[in-house]
């Protein structure tokens, strides 16, 4: 099976790499614009220059292209705890990240939120916090993991998943309750 190509890919595939087919004359291949620039006017004929203009402030193109407009620079989302790692230039989008001792959680492909790395209080660090993953904690005896925090087994209800980890403590609590019911 031949993979389906979009119209733009079909047009580009007729020309050698670094060139694109003139939209009004498919016998002409024009040179693509360099990153940091955009297409202002197609080349007038074979071997003639494409009219490329530099992206204006607040916009960029990160690769060679024949776009009619530069792409708008991304803004770091303060409400998600994001901070700017590097600002937008004509040939590179803004890079957003998190502060020290924080990690990124991706809610979707293009949206992340910054959260504090867990400190593993009442436990030990099994895997250190990474750029896109929270610390992995192992809890001490008498504690169980809930929302990546080590919580005392005294907070373990019988219906919760912690019952296996806290089984001796649960039995002790049950025994104490039963002893007063004679």
């Amino acid at each position: 099976l031949v993979p389906h190509l979009g119209d733009r890919e079909k047009r580009d595939s007729v020309c050698p790499q670094g060139k694109y087919i003139h939209p009004q004359n498919n016998s002409i291949c024009c040179t693509k614009c360099h990153k940091g620039t955009y297409l202002y006017n197609d080349c007038p004929g074979p071997g003639q220059d494409t009219d490329c203009r530099e992206c204006e402030s607040g916009s960029f193109t990160a690769s060679e292209n024949h776009l009619r407009h530069c792409l708008s620079c991304s803004k770091c989302r303060k409400e998600m705890g994001q901070v700017e790692i590097s600002s937008c230039t004509v040939d590179r989008d803004t890079v957003c990240g998190c502060r020290k001792n924080q990690y990124r959680h991706y809610w979707s492909e293009n949206l992340f939120q910054c959260f504090n790395c867990s400190l593993c209080l009442n436990g030990t660090v099994h895997l250190s916090c990474q750029e896109k993953q929270n610390t992995v904690c192992t809890c001490h005896a008498g504690f169980f993991l809930r929302e990546n925090e080590c919580v005392s087994c005294s907070n373990c209800k019988k219906s919760l998943e912690c019952t296996k980890l806290c089984l001796p403590q649960i039995e002790n609590v049950k025994g104490t309750e039963d002893s007063g019911t004679t």
């Epitope: 803004k75 409400e79 998600m80 939120q113 959260f115 990546n148």
Partner: nanobody, 119 residues
Framework: EVQLLESGGGLVQPGGSLRLSCAAS????????MVWVRQAPGKGLEWVSH????????FYADSVKGRFTISRDNSKNTLYLQMNSLRAEDTAVYYC????????????WGQGTLVTVSS
């Protein structure tokens, strides 16, 4: 006690519109970023949109961009989601929620309102 109550769901034909509302109480609504998430039948939660406290620069998932509009009325403690050009794939239970703070889970969200897009 935080309470979030969604309304406005229902059955609508493809291409139709609906406006969801979320009445909030038990916290200072005007200080919180609010979120719409949805869960299609047999699928996981999908982040639809969120709006910061001042209402500026809301975020939209690519799947709803240009069709949905999130807004809020801080004087009425209410969050809205205007849904236009609805498609069958928008069929889901829609929940409003407070933006998580402690970790990647929702501490506070509503009971949901069902949106069904079908002819």
């Amino acid at each position: 006690e935080v309470q979030l109550l969604e309304s406005g769901g229902g059955l609508v034909q493809p291409g139709g519109s609906l406006r969801l509302s979320c009445a909030a109480s038990g916290f200072t609504f005007a200080h919180e970023t609010m979120v719409w998430v949805r869960q299609a039948p047999g699928k996981g939660l999908e982040w639809v949109s969120h709006i910061p406290p001042d209402g500026q620069d809301p975020f939209y998932a690519d799947s709803v961009k240009g069709r949905f509009t999130i807004s809020r009325d801080n004087s009425k403690n209410t969050l809205y989601l205007q849904m236009n050009s609805l498609r069958a794939e928008d069929t889901a239970v829609y929940y409003c929620a407070l933006l998580p703070k402690r970790g990647p889970w929702f501490d506070y969200w509503g009971q949901g309102t069902l949106v069904t897009v079908s002819s």
